[in-house]
Amino acid sequence: DTHKSEVAHRFKDLGEEHFKGLVLVAFSQYLQQCPFEEHVKLVNEVTEFAKTCVADESAENCDKSLHTLFGDKLCTVATLRETYGEMADCCAKQEPERNECFLQHKDDNPNLPPLVRPEVDVMCTAFHDNEATFLKKYLYEVARRHPYFYAPELLFFAARYKAAFAECCQAADKAACLLPKLDELRDEGKASSAKQRLKCASLQKFGDRAFKAWAVARLSQKFPKAEFAEVSKLVTDLTKVHTECCHGDLLECADDRADLAKYMCENQDSISSKLKECCDKPLLEKSHCLAEVENDEMPADLPSLAADYVESKDVCKNYAEAKDVFLGMFLYEYARRHPDYSVMLLLRLAKAYEATLEKCCAAADPHECYAKVFDEFQPLVEEPQNLVKQNCELFEQLGEYKFQNALLVRYTKKVPQVSTPTLVEVSRNLGKVGAKCCKLPEAKRMPCAEDYLSVVLNRLCVLHEKTPVSEKVTKCCTESLVNRRPCFSALELDEAYVPKAFNAETFTFHADMCTLSEKEKQVKKQTALVELVKHKPKATKEQLKGVMDNFAAFVEKCCKADDKEACFAEEGPKFVAASQAALA
């Protein structure tokens, strides 16, 4: 379905508001350091041009591809070389290489200041004075910090952001109304960004076969009543949507996502009984709702899988005829029966099944060879079950902060070369698995925990790829997507690591500690803990706990003192000396 003008086609499909929002997101994700006003100017120019193409699709340049149009526009930025260095070299390339070049320069950890939330009255005034600019600024600030954020979903977040201000700026207690909503949007936004980053990593590093396998497993769990052909169609469409978004083709992605939502709502009867309430909602909300929809009930009396996949004499014949289809059906059948398994476990089982068939279908007696294949699954299933049980028990024992500290120590000992900020960020997020998943019923714990851990560990992989420092991390990140988490779990203490020299400056604290929020205080303490482990990797957890308890006491004492700075100056060196003695 070709169009004379791609830009006109997308403008008409999406409407002006969504078109402008998506172009702003695309530009902000590519040129993450450019000022807001510059992006708004570029977006307005693109929008005016799109309107001329809507009026006359044969007008000059209207037949150009979106990559050509957008790339040409980005390359007009005057300060490209000064601001972005070698990214400016992308502009010397032709499409499609130019777009690939821009994609490669997306920065997962841009050097941008943390977003500071102004006073509620200040925000409400800004919202009322110029609502459009206020919302554009939100899209810009989120997109430049999260260059792989799922763009159509970001439009949904912006709609919720707008609704929060529209409601709360009228409220009697604006802050009480608004702040919890903004906190929720921030936390959900970070989670959404991290989940999408894993999808993009899956596509870009492991190919669309890996993503399709993930999607077959997940959609089969969600839609166990749907037939394999239906699930396959949804997987194909979903893969196209995410390939486009991860590739920077945000207009096509949003358009295709809307088409997918429309298809699902028109075919609910053959997909899931849970879609009904999603389908009554407006587009952005509907797509979000469909993506988050709960698993449908499993059909009653599903037959045993063994008949078709172990006992049948035709297993090797069926496998040889269409390997990927046969494995896809196996994965579909297994996943629809196991909403209690993580997607990553299901993919490991499919991989193990594939390896067994590859070996056994070449053997003298294939049936005899693969007869016990399901028994081989048991250890694979028990490993994440044990991991979740063990982690949840420890979380229950320690609480979130101390559980994070246990993980910080564990991961710092495994990969001490990784930067301290990365270890703190990743371990804090790994530790959040407890509050997120351990309260759930047994049947939901593993899918919650292991699939969440995969998202967090992907963040480690993405950050590490930018600045590689550990062969062990590179190995776990690149060898197998589905085995990343078990690979990290199995890492041992790095015996070759040379302890970091002691630096007193790292353990020097000031009165500004006292004005920090509870979260910021925790991050400071956890940063010190990581540095401590890097300095003394053989220290026992008991020793480290003692030092951390003393640290907390020292900070509390000085924050209660009349002259806080003097207290820190006097007590700090004592704390450092005592800590060194305790760890000697």
């Epitope: 028990e393 420890l394 993980l407 779990s489 199995a490 890492l491 041992e492 026992t540 957890k541």
Partner: nanobody
Framework: QVQLVESGGGLVQAGGSLRLSCAAS????????MGWFRQAPGKERVFVAT???????YYADSVKGRFTISRDHAKNTVYLQMNNLKPEDTAVYYC????????????????WGQGTQVTVSS
């Protein structure tokens, strides 16, 4: 000073049983995970079994159904009942403890005993 002292090792015929004990001292261990690793000649130390502060148990696949780990919180002691022993179970068995006990790798455990030899003859 934390100490873990194993006992109960020895020579046994294949198919026989042994019960290992590990007495912990130097502090209270009621919140610790405690367990057992083993090391066969020329091999790495490998996980055998562990028991959490809540008395949840975890076993290596190779010993599941044959070995049982248990603990007595009051006595700061952990036990390993080994039934239907096989020649491949021959190893030095080490008692371990850790205040967090997260994981199944040797480096996940801070405290180790000296080990007790178990030899299974065929």
């Amino acid at each position: 000073q934390v100490q873990l002292v194993e006992s109960g090792g020895g020579l046994v015929q294949a198919g026989g049983s042994l019960r290992l004990s590990c007495a912990a001292s130097g502090r209270t261990f009621s919140n610790d995970a405690m367990g057992w690793f083993r090391q066969a000649p020329g091999k790495e130390r490998v996980f055998v079994a562990t028991i959490s502060w809540k008395s949840s148990t975890y076993y290596a696949d190779s010993v599941k159904g044959r070995f049982t780990i248990s603990r007595d919180h009051a006595k700061n002691t952990v036990y390993l009942q080994m039934n239907n022993l096989k020649p491949e179970d021959t190893a030095v068995y080490y008692c371990v403890a850790d205040p967090y006990g997260l994981g199944f790798n040797p480096s996940d455990y801070d405290y180790w005993g000296q080990g007790t030899q178990v030899t299974v003859s065929s």
